[in-house]
């Protein structure tokens, strides 16, 4: 994911226990990892800006059969005040990058992180 | 290995200012808060205030009033705590102390603390 | 505020003991809970975080439980270097607060 440090309001900011909740969810996922996250697949990279949540649904949502991302689609689909369906692609996404899901996973931790700290001290 | 390092003792008399520094080593400053905690001679522990030191966002403990300053200084990965308008009362030892909220708690590193006397 | 009680704020106890420390938040504070042990003119060093988390090079004689407003520090088995003062901190929402402290000395 790039734009990491991006100061552009992340969209509709979810409250801070449902922030909070998701980022415990990717810790989860993170931690929890043995295997290649949801064997290795593939998504597209997207900026960290406005309309973040829709973004990284979008990207997440083409995975499937992977259940340790299945609650994490589920909150940022809580997130995005439009419906998101698989193929669908929104400006936000680096479409001349992939990475693995494991990746996108941590970046998305980090920069959620950032914005929960942010939130906390201001 | 994490490293949270205080300045030294001081002594300082009532109506003064106290500025207390905490050096930070071993990770990256910016990705976790920094708190501040107070402990008075035989008493408990007190949360003073916390920083973000990416934004330099702030919180702190309204039982100070305002006499709290918090700051990072992102180019020598310090955080300082100013405490002014001492009284005797501020006599104790003063620690920071931070971490990852996610991953430890935000209280998972501690310096080695700084005794503050406040006397006329 | 939160308010953090801590029970109890003292205790004898020997080596080989199981000890229980117990802590009640004035209301639920989402298991986001530490524990921590201090010794004299030492700085407070961490042991438990998320209520039931526990520190990397910790014991693991040491365990934590608890949810929503009421948790439990126990100690297994009492080990000589166990004796300190222990406290718990809810970190939920500001301002943090401390549980007052429970004393473990040597009975």
């Known amino acids: 994911l790039t734009c990491l440090g991006g100061f552009a309001s992340p969209g509709p900011v979810p409250p801070s226990t449902a922030l909070r909740e998701l980022i415990e969810e990717l810790v989860n996922i993170t931690q929890n990892q043995k295997a290649p996250l949801c064997n290795g697949s593939m998504v597209w990279s997207i900026n960290l800006t406005a309309g973040m949540y829709c973004a990284a649904l979008e990207s997440l949502i083409n995975v499937s059969g992977c259940s340790a991302i299945e609650k994490t689609q589920r909150m940022l689909s809580g997130f995005c005040p439009h419906k998101v369906s698989a193929g669908q692609f929104s400006s936000l996404h680096v479409r001349d990058t992939k990475i693995e899901v494991a990746q996108f996973v941590k970046d998305l931790l980090l920069h959620l992180k950032k914005l929960f700290r942010e939130g906390q001290f201001n | 290995e994490v490293q949270l390092v205080q300045s030294g003792a001081e002594v300082k008399k009532p109506g003064a200012t106290v500025k207390i520094s905490c050096k930070v080593s071993?990770?990256?400053?910016?990705?976790?808060?920094m708190h501040w905690v107070q402990q008075a001679p035989g008493k408990g522990l007190e949360w003073m205030g916390g920083?973000?030191?990416?934004?330099?966002?702030?919180a702190s403990n309204q039982k100070f009033k305002g006499r709290v300053t918090l700051t990072a200084d992102k180019s020598t990965d310090t955080a300082y705590m100013e405490l002014s308008s001492l009284r005797s009362e501020d006599t104790a030892v003063y620690y920071c102390?931070?971490?990852?909220?996610f991953g430890g708690g935000p209280f998972a590193y501690w310096g080695q603390g700084t005794l503050v006397t406040v006397s006329s | 505020d939160i308010q953090m009680t801590q029970s109890p704020s003292s205790l004898s106890a020997s080596v080989g003991d199981r000890v229980t420390i117990t802590c009640k938040a004035s209301?639920?504070?989402?298991?986001?809970l530490s524990w921590f042990q201090q010794k004299p003119g030492k700085a407070p060093k961490s042991l438990i975080y998320?209520?039931?988390r526990l520190v990397d090079g910790v014991p693991s004689r040491f365990s934590g439980s608890g949810s929503g407003t009421d948790f439990t520090l126990t100690i297994s088995s009492l080990q000589p270097e166990d004796f300190a003062t222990y406290y718990c901190?809810?970190?939920?929402?500001?301002?943090?607060?401390f549980g007052g402290g429970t004393k473990v000395e040597i009975k």
């Open positions: 901190l809810q970190y939920d929402e500001f301002p943090y607060t």
């Open positions: 102390t931070s971490g990852d909220y």
């Open positions: 920083i973000d030191p990416e934004t330099g966002g702030t």
């Open positions: 209301q639920d504070i989402n298991s986001y």
């Open positions: 071993g990770y990256t400053f910016t990705d976790y808060e």
């Open positions: 998320r209520a039931n």
